[in-house]
Interface confidence: medium
């Protein structure tokens, strides 16, 4: 059995991951990417394309971030003037920031809602 | 047999303009993104212009933001960069280039077309 | 912008020894790094790709490796016509950028 994929003459696209099979072998898209429209996964002719998650909108990046398509995946960064926090990593999926101006603030004595929270932190970004 | 042929290089006084033309064969032209690189004197390589598949989109770097300009004709099989206000820095060897994808490598590269700026 | 480290401009070696070229990022591209040969009047070739897949009909004396910041090409039995320029190039982001390349030379 030849192995197509490591003969010197590689039969896949660059977007794909070849997979030697026992007399055959597969062009698979790579973690992240997706088949272009109309391009099946899988056969000699199969072109992949890197997923945009940030354009598509298939992200899970915090609203104090911005969305970075990496290749085959994401990142979340601060947004500028924003840093990580208490100890986040920056640059992570997780990835969660606070204004360095006001990181600080909190809300008003009593306030323990969630939802109450979040709309303060509305008010306060209204006020910037 | 894959080929990309550049035309249009020159000799242009400082603040000119030139248009460059790719013509590609050999491999499907609609389905690749393509890119303009070039090699200044001291040999180094720079990214120039990118654009996608169907023209709707296309990158620059600073360098060249404002002053150039890629586009692409499908139904021709041609690339094109039109560029304007040109500064000495510009003086390069200009390849076009095709690759399978925003973020893959360079797999086609034309014999590329010399741009001297001069004052 | 993320830059391509080459540090040696010039590598001397002799046919049939085995040597290595090395580029570093400036920041993590995971395995997003191409390697191209350019040989006098002529335009860059494709050699390796995702850092160590061979491209078509690229002898297999060629072997690229590497992954996050730091990579390097091999090239295990120099051949005469394997003197020329190397460059390296990242594709994780945009602008997509070059090393400066590496001129392999005889001893």
């Known amino acids: 059995d030849v192995n197509e994929c490591t003969s010197g003459q590689n039969p896949c696209h660059s977007s794909t991951h070849c997979l030697n099979n026992v007399g055959s072998y597969q062009c698979r898209c790579r973690p992240g990417w997706q088949p272009i429209p109309g391009s099946p996964n899988g056969p000699n002719n199969t072109v992949c394309e890197d997923v945009d998650e940030c354009s598509s909108g298939q992200h899970q990046c915090d609203s104090s971030t911005v969305c970075f398509n990496t290749v085959g995946s994401y990142s979340c960064r601060c947004r500028p003037g924003w840093k990580p926090r208490h100890g986040i990593p920056n640059n992570q999926k997780d990835t969660v920031c606070e204004d360095m101006t006001f990181s600080t603030w909190t809300p008003p004595p009593g306030v323990h809602s969630q939802t109450l929270s979040r709309f303060f932190d509305k008010v306060q970004d209204l006020g910037r | 047999d894959v080929k990309l042929v550049e035309s249009g290089g020159g000799l242009v006084k400082l603040g000119g303009s030139l248009k460059f033309s790719c013509a590609a064969s050999?491999?499907?032209?609609?389905?690749?993104?393509m890119s303009w690189v070039r090699q200044t004197p001291e040999k180094r390589l720079e990214l120039v212009a990118a654009i996608n598949i169907n023209g709707g989109s296309t990158y620059y770097p600073d360098t060249v933001k404002g002053r150039f300009t890629i586009s692409r004709d499908n139904a021709k099989n041609t690339l094109y960069l039109q560029m304007s206000s040109l500064k000495s820095e510009d003086t390069a060897l200009y390849y076009c280039a095709g690759h399978g994808g925003l973020r893959l490598p360079f797999e086609y590269w034309g014999q590329g077309t010399t741009l001297t700026v001069s004052s | 912008d993320i830059v391509m480290t080459q540090s040696h401009k010039f590598m001397s070696t002799s046919v049939g020894d085995r040597v290595s070229i090395t580029c570093k990022a400036s920041?993590?591209?995971?395995?997003?790094v191409a390697w191209y040969q350019q040989k006098p009047g002529h335009s860059p070739k494709l050699l390796i790709y995702?850092?160590?897949t061979r491209h078509t009909g690229v002898p297999d004396r060629f072997t690229g490796s590497g992954s996050g910041t730091d990579f390097s090409l091999t090239i295990s039995s120099v051949q005469s016509e394997d003197l020329t320029d190397y460059f390296c190039?990242?594709?994780?982001?945009?602008?997509?950028?070059f090393g400066g390349g590496t001129k392999l030379e005889i001893k």
């Open positions: 190039q990242q594709y994780s982001s945009y602008p997509l950028t």
């Open positions: 920041q993590n591209v995971g395995t997003s």
């Open positions: 050999g491999f499907t032209f609609s389905s690749y993104y």
């Open positions: 995702w850092a160590s």
